[in-house]
């Protein structure tokens, strides 16, 4: 079941998943000047079964000049606000995701992909937060958020992380402790 909302936004922090649960969508977004091909899917889908999962559909981008599109007149800043999800300059493989049944690895980049990946997560997904460069993490608890189902509605737990403006960066849990993966975590909360 898809989570209704996006994970919480923490000032001066980004989040990422170590692996993606089946049913997760990754939007086919393209960088400026390029567009999803006309016959292309809206998204890639993590699909499969408990023993093997993979990404279904392929994202393809084409030059926007070759498509019947109109440029929006509202001026868009080239640098938008701090990115809250995966930035694609550094593809991530922080843990051995093959050991997570029912999960997909981070999919490889596609040509002319946008810098920011837009995921639609499913119930039970866990994401991990880290402070952006130039900010230091003050932990009051786990720097992670889980999408849970409660009383028929989805919600993300609040990560216990504050990022302060000191020139020291923290790592994602999986990068400093490879065992800190979604394995063994509660997948959903259905009791009311």
């Amino acid at each position: 079941e898809l989570c209704d909302d996006d994970p919480p936004e923490i000032p001066h922090a980004t989040f990422k998943a170590m692996a993606y649960k089946e049913g997760t969508m990754l939007n086919c977004e393209c960088k400026r000047g390029f567009r999803r091909i006309k016959s292309g899917s809206l998204y890639m889908l993590c699909t499969g079964n408990s023993s093997h999962s993979s990404w279904d559909n392929q994202c393809q981008c084409t030059s926007s000049a070759t498509r019947n599109t109109t440029k929006q007149v509202t001026p868009q800043p080239e640098e938008q606000k701090e990115r809250k999800t995966t930035e694609m300059q550094s593809p991530m493989q922080p843990v051995d995701q093959a050991s997570l049944p029912g999960h997909c690895r981070e999919p490889p980049p596609w040509e002319n992909e946008a810098t920011e990946r837009i995921y639609h997560f499913v119930v039970g997904q866990m994401v991990y937060y880290q402070c952006v460069q130039g900010y230091r993490a003050l932990h009051r608890g786990p720097a992670e958020s889980v999408c849970k189902m409660t009383h028929g509605k989805t919600r993300w737990t609040q990560p216990q992380l504050i990022c302060t403006g000191e020139m020291e960066t923290s790592q994602f849990p999986g990068e400093e402790k490879p065992q800190a993966s979604p394995e063994g975590r509660p997948e959903s909360e259905t009791s009311c």
Partner: antibody, heavy 114, light 107 residues
């Protein structure tokens, strides 16, 4: 909570135009396409087109090229659709949709009548 | 354009029954199909994405299946609140297209 709030019903004259709005809340407006869908009794649902507020690109169903104009204002997280040269065929409920069709607005009823 | 055909405009069923709504695409659309439920006077509600994945809050009596050109929405243990019109949609290629709808009537 993700919400798409559409503007109210419109009663308009043939030959004129109408502009309706769709205000998004509860998610990052610039991250997701916003599409528009037309519904007329006996005609089912028709996809009009969509706009990406972040990239600013727009796609139209060829059937609605020249009829519909899609715009978006990122400062207010609002998408707009203008319909021109209205006829009775344009009398319908118009929905905005987002987040890969997961979320739908409540609809705007447009009635074209002399 | 891809034509999505829902051959049955109306279906009649009883509470507790199992009913299957079908949808046929004029060409291969993979699993890029969604199902929507629309109750009288309301906007459509998304039930299923990618042919078989349920959205949050959708009861598990709603099941989607199929790929390629043939798709089915199955409602097991039909409830009175399932009285609605059901639409399929393909988003495999532009322009995205919808089926004509199937109205479910409860006996």
């Amino acid at each position: 909570q993700v919400q798409l709030q559409q503007s109210g019903a419109e009663l308009v004259r043939p030959g004129t135009s109408v502009k309706m709005s769709c205000k998004a809340a509860g998610y990052t407006f610039t991250n997701y396409w916003i599409g528009w869908v037309k519904q007329r009794p006996g005609h089912g649902l028709e996809w009009i087109g969509d706009i990406h507020p972040g990239g600013g690109y727009i796609d139209y169903n060829e059937k609605f090229t020249g009829k519909a104009t899609l715009t978006a204002d990122t400062s207010s997280s609002t998408a707009y659709m203008q319909l021109s040269s209205l006829t009775s065929e344009d009398s319908a409920i118009y929905y905005c949709v987002s987040r890969n069709f997961a979320k739908w607005g409540q609809g705007t009823l447009v009635t074209v009548s002399a | 354009d891809v034509v999505m055909t829902q051959s049955q405009k109306f279906m009649s069923t009883s509470v507790g029954d199992r009913v299957s709504v079908t949808c046929k695409a004029s060409q291969n659309v993979g699993t890029n199909v969604a199902w929507y439920q629309q109750k009288p006077g309301q906007s459509p509600k998304a039930l299923i994405y990618s042919a078989s994945y349920r959205y949050s809050g959708v009861p598990d009596r709603f099941t989607g299946s199929g790929s390629g050109t043939d798709f089915t929405l199955t409602i097991s243990n039909v409830q009175s609140e399932d009285l609605a019109e059901y639409f399929c949609q393909q988003y495999n290629s532009y322009p995205y297209t919808f089926g004509g709808g199937t109205k479910l009537e409860i006996k």
